[in-house]
């Protein structure tokens, strides 16, 4: 049975220009975590396997950083990428923890980081 | 430039062991994936497991269930693919492969090793 | 694990013909495809990736797309020296696993 829960940093905003750390956690579960694929609507971004290291996509390579931890860093801004993103766990024996993360690129000043939240 | 060259060929009985060496140059070792994959006679490719020769991390395919070690020798920066327990279905070209830098895809592959399990 | 299936299995065709090979995965694997060309008794040559993009030195007439589940690779006009077996390959998940491979003949 999985057990376990993905927490994220839930709906974000951040300047158009700026990066933004996308950051899941999972939790509540003793599966092993073996990977880690961050995804945006039909695309892949980036792949964290624990054993084999990261693969960044080649359309995300100049403005995507590994990290921190299993988490994504996504550089030089702009209002395309406001969207949803997905952090897909895999794990033994568990199987696969989806968490969802919005993203809002504003042209202003005003961003603000959201509140975390729970996905079950 | 990149090369890859692997051992030569092997007979070998069945249930003994063979080790396949995978020697690079052109390159820095320890900043690339090495992979090793097979190919049957007819058949498809089949991945056997990989290894990140800077932590030593190792990934293998379970369907091998532990008959597959994948080994780093960093300073003579060569890869070694031991596969035990060897049956004849094991008979195959054995290939290793880098992937590339924070890249997945296999980019250079060695010339294949044929193994052939025979009593 | 995941399993790609490509169509057809092989096919008989002409120099200057347009190829479209297709491949389907058994479950969603995002854009992790991968292309490979292979002729007999050489090792696999990395083509396409990600999985449109022409690996350094692949001659345009080379492409590829999709995403999911469905991936399809085309050689717009087969030259010559294209005739070989074409494989697809996920890696978004481990085990990384292959299609069955497409023999491009000449007719």
């Known amino acids: 049975m999985m057990t376990g829960t993905i927490e994220t940093t839930g709906n974000i905003s951040a300047e158009k220009g700026g990066s933004i750390i996308l950051q899941c956690h999972l939790s509540s579960t003793t599966a092993q975590v073996t990977q880690v694929n961050w995804e945006q609507q039909d695309q892949l971004l980036a792949i964290c396997n624990a054993d084999l290291g990261w693969h960044i996509s080649p359309s995300f390579k100049d403005r995507v950083a590994p990290g921190p931890g299993l988490g994504l860093t996504l550089q030089s801004l702009t209002v395309n990428d406001t969207g949803e993103y997905f952090c897909i766990y895999h794990t033994y024996p568990d199987g696969t923890y989806t968490g969802r993360i919005f993203l809002e690129v504003l042209e202003s000043s005003v961003a603000e980081h959201g509140a975390r939240f729970q996905i079950p | 430039q990149v090369q890859l060259v692997q051992s030569g060929a092997e007979v070998v009985k069945p249930g003994a062991s063979v080790k396949v060496s995978c020697k690079t140059s052109?390159?820095?070792?320890?900043?690339?994936?090495m992979h090793w994959v097979r190919q049957a006679p007819g058949q498809r490719l089949e991945w056997m497991g990989g290894?990140?020769?800077?932590?030593?991390?190792?990934r293998n395919n379970q369907k091998f269930k532990g008959r597959v070690t994948i080994t780093v020798d960093t300073s003579a920066s060569t890869a070694y693919m031991e596969l035990s327990s060897l049956r004849s279905e094991d008979t195959a070209v054995y290939y290793c492969?880098?992937?590339?830098?924070?890249?997945?895809?296999?980019?250079?592959w060695g010339q294949g090793t044929l193994v052939t399990v025979s009593s | 694990d995941i399993q790609m299936t490509q169509s057809p299995s092989s096919l008989s065709t002409s120099v200057g013909d347009r190829v479209t090979i297709t491949c389907k995965a058994s479950?969603?694997?995002?854009?992790?495809v991968v292309w490979y060309q292979q002729k007999p008794g050489k090792a696999p040559k990395l083509l396409i990736y990600?999985?449109?993009y022409r690996y350094t030195g692949v001659p345009s007439r080379f492409s590829g797309s999709g995403s999911g589940t469905d991936f399809t690779f085309t050689i717009s006009s087969l030259q010559p020296e294209d005739f070989a077996t074409y494989y697809c390959q996920q890696h978004y998940s481990t085990p990384w696993t292959f299609g069955q491979g497409t023999k491009v003949e000449i007719k």
């Open positions: 479950q969603h694997v995002s854009t992790a």
């Open positions: 492969a880098r992937s590339g830098l924070r890249d997945y895809a296999m980019d250079y």
């Open positions: 052109g390159y820095t070792f320890t900043e690339n994936t």
């Open positions: 990600s999985p449109s």
């Open positions: 290894i990140n020769p800077q932590n030593g991390g190792n």
